[in-house]
């Protein structure tokens, strides 16, 4: 039985050129992870954490996809062409795959100036 | 298409060391993981260990720990595994396979012919 | 370490039956199960992965079932070509164990 659930960073947003942190994390589950892979919106593969093997990148994104902080991901240089959905997929065993989702949106500088000027604390 | 191509057959002497290359071609070898199988006479399947292509991270079979060392070569696309301390059940056909853990799945889709090892004083 | 048993370790079948061959885990595996062919001789093929997920390329009378401990390999009508062993693997971490094989032979 799956009992664990998938705590992501939901929506966000992040400056043209900058760089992102995506996260998720697994929770109330004893199950093993085995693997955890990072998808884009399209269902490209962005990058790869085996438990044995270590953090794989896909070539196509090996010069803006940097791996971590931890089982996340940090993806730099972003354009506008990476506002999307992003999914983690959770290998675990014995309760299979955890799916979890975010939404990040990208935005032009300016934009992205005035909105965290209104953010509430 | 995908090609492995393992060295030949390898005739040792109890207690030498034996060397089998596996050569990659028709995928980017470093965005994989290379697998080592080896199969005895009349014997079925032993997984032995595997090491990715792209940081050169490996796992080996807890009973050929100590004995075995997996290698890559990504200038030149090959993977390398080395058997020390040779004894006469280690003769086997040594198999070589690309690891599909893109997937999650961790199967082997693509296989070397085989690398016959026969230790024998 | 998590042990694969499979079921029968031989079996003799006419040319058109459906044949199935089991595979136990001795603890839950979810659905990280492969299932490998090797015809006489050859190099051993992936037929079947992620339990039930046919590989590209491999004849539609092969279908995998199964998850957590218990898993079946179908053929679903044998063929001539078909005369191999089969073996399931623990495809979830290492180590990833191979079952002790099933020799499939026409009658």
């Known amino acids: 039985m799956m009992t664990g659930t998938i705590e992501t960073t939901g929506n966000i947003s992040a400056k043209k050129g900058g760089s992102v942190i995506l996260q998720c994390h697994l929770s109330s589950t004893m199950a093993q992870v085995t693997q955890v892979n990072w998808e884009q919106h399209d269902h490209s593969l962005l990058a790869i954490r085996n438990a044995e093997l270590g953090w794989h990148i896909y070539p196509a994104f090996k010069d803006r996809v940097a791996p971590g902080p931890g089982l996340g991901l940090t993806l730099q240089s972003l354009t506008m062409n990476d506002t999307g959905e992003y999914f983690c997929t959770y290998h675990t065993y014995p309760d299979g795959t955890y799916r979890g989702r975010i939404f990040l949106e990208v935005l032009e500088s300016s934009v992205a100036e005035h909105s965290a000027r209104f953010q509430i604390p | 298409q995908v090609q492995l191509v393992q060295s030949g057959t390898e005739v040792k002497k109890p207690g030498a060391s034996v060397k089998v290359s596996c050569k990659a071609s028709?995928?980017?070898?470093?965005?994989?993981?290379i697998t080592w199988v080896r199969q005895a006479p009349g014997q079925g399947l032993e997984w032995m260990g595997w090491?990715?292509?792209?940081?050169?991270?490996?796992n080996y079979a807890q009973k050929l720990q100590g004995r075995v060392t997996m290698t890559t070569d990504t200038s030149t696309s090959t993977a390398y595994m080395e058997l020390r301390s040779l004894r006469s059940d280690d003769t086997a056909v040594y198999y070589c396979?690309?690891?599909?853990?893109?997937?999650?799945?961790?199967?082997?889709?693509?296989w070397g012919q085989g690398t016959l090892v026969t230790v024998s004083s | 370490d998590i042990q694969m048993t499979q079921s029968p370790s031989s079996l003799s079948a006419s040319v058109g039956d459906r044949v199935t061959i089991t595979c136990r885990a001795s603890?839950?595996?979810?659905?990280?199960l492969a299932w490998y062919q090797q015809k006489p001789g050859k190099v051993p093929k992936v037929l079947i992965y992620?339990?039930?997920t046919l590989q590209s390329g491999v004849p539609s009378r092969f279908s995998g079932s199964g998850s957590g401990t218990d898993f079946t390999l179908t053929i679903s009508s044998l063929q001539p070509e078909d005369v191999a062993t089969y073996y399931c693997?623990?495809?979830?971490?290492?180590?990833?164990?191979f079952g002790g094989g099933t020799k499939v032979e026409i009658k």
């Open positions: 396979a690309r690891v599909d853990f893109w997937s999650g799945y961790n199967y082997f889709d693509y």
């Open positions: 090491i990715s292509a792209y940081n050169g991270n490996t």
């Open positions: 603890q839950g595996i979810s659905n990280y």
């Open positions: 028709g995928y980017t070898f470093s965005s994989y993981a």
């Open positions: 693997q623990k495809s979830n971490s290492a180590p990833l164990t």
């Open positions: 992620a339990a039930s």
